[in-house]
């Protein structure tokens, strides 16, 4: 018979032969042959593999470094990685939660809608037309553009969400 060019799900092609993949939690020790099945071994302590695989090494569980404010939210198994979270009152810097911050800042162009608490991080909102923020801040709201008219001045440069308007003197008509 012709050697296969593709294999079924949970199999892989090697040496013109379809071998079974190792199940999650196990790593590949040796490929199958015409006479033997794929040989797999369970991952060791503090290791995991989360897919059907042909990996020869298991992945190390993530380390939740207390020096970065991290602690274990969910202990890893042979099939799952450890999930880290931040100490109470601190917030993850990313979905992967690789480090912690007291709170995040809102970038220029955004203002603080709600200051961070122990349970929720800073909530930012874009500065609407007529308002701006030119700083990165964890407490400052968007500021209204300066009203040139109330100072008897005219707008020389329009404001943006990151910059205030620039006011200047009105052109005087010469007599």
């Amino acid at each position: 018979p012709e050697p296969p060019t593709a294999c079924r799900e949970k199999q892989y092609l090697i040496n013109s032969q379809c071998c079974s993949l190792c199940q999650p939690g196990q790593k590949l020790v040796s490929d199958c042959t015409e006479f033997t099945e794929t040989e797999c071994l369970p991952c060791g302590e503090s290791e995991f593999l989360d897919t059907w695989n042909r990996e020869t090494h298991c992945h190390q569980h993530k380390y939740c470094d207390p020096n970065l404010g991290l602690r274990v939210q969910q202990k890893g198994t042979s099939e799952t990685d450890t999930i880290c979270t931040c100490e109470e009152g601190w917030h993850c810097t990313s979905e992967a939660c690789e480090s912690c911050v007291l709170h995040r800042s809102c970038s220029p162009g955004f203002g603080v809608k709600q200051i961070a608490t122990g349970v929720s991080d800073t909530i930012c909102e874009p500065c609407p037309v007529g308002f701006f923020s030119n700083v990165s801040s964890a407490f400052e709201k968007c500021h209204p553009w300066t009203s040139c008219e109330t100072k008897d001045l005219v707008v020389q440069q329009a404001g943006t969400n990151k910059t205030d308007v620039v006011c200047g003197p009105q052109d005087r008509l010469r007599a």
Epitope: N67, L68, S99, V101, S105, V135, S137, F139, E140
Partner: nanobody, 116 residues
């Protein structure tokens, strides 16, 4: 990397005053937003006060408004918190924090106890 060292805490009677300092080394605080945060025994972190990088804007938690004043002296690389009319509920460890507020910038804090 910035190191923050808080000082000035201690035991004070209700109605008394204290001035906390936060001295930075290894990096400047100039131009950076700064915060005072506290943690009372058995409680979570409470954000007390903040000051903008320019010093022109400040924030105070409702619980300290009118009693605490935040200030900065960038030439001394130091942040301050003047605490007046102290109450028992102000008892906590006080920490300062600098943008970007990462855990590894966190100081040891200075304990404040308000008791008669």
């Amino acid at each position: 990397e910035v190191q923050l060292l808080e000082s000035g805490g201690g035991l004070v009677q209700p109605g008394g005053s204290l001035r906390l300092s936060c001295a930075a080394s290894g990096s400047t605080i100039a131009g950076y937003e700064m915060w005072w945060v506290r943690q009372a025994p058995g409680k979570g972190l409470e954000r007390v006060s903040a000051i903008s990088g320019s010093g022109g804007s400040t924030y105070y938690a409702d619980s300290v408004k009118g009693r605490f004043t935040i200030s900065r002296d960038d030439s001394k690389n130091t942040l301050y918190l003047q605490m007046n009319s102290l109450r028992a509920e102000d008892t906590a460890v006080y920490y300062c924090a600098r943008d970007p507020y990462s855990f590894d910038y966190w100081g040891q804090g200075t304990p404040v106890t308000v008791s008669s």
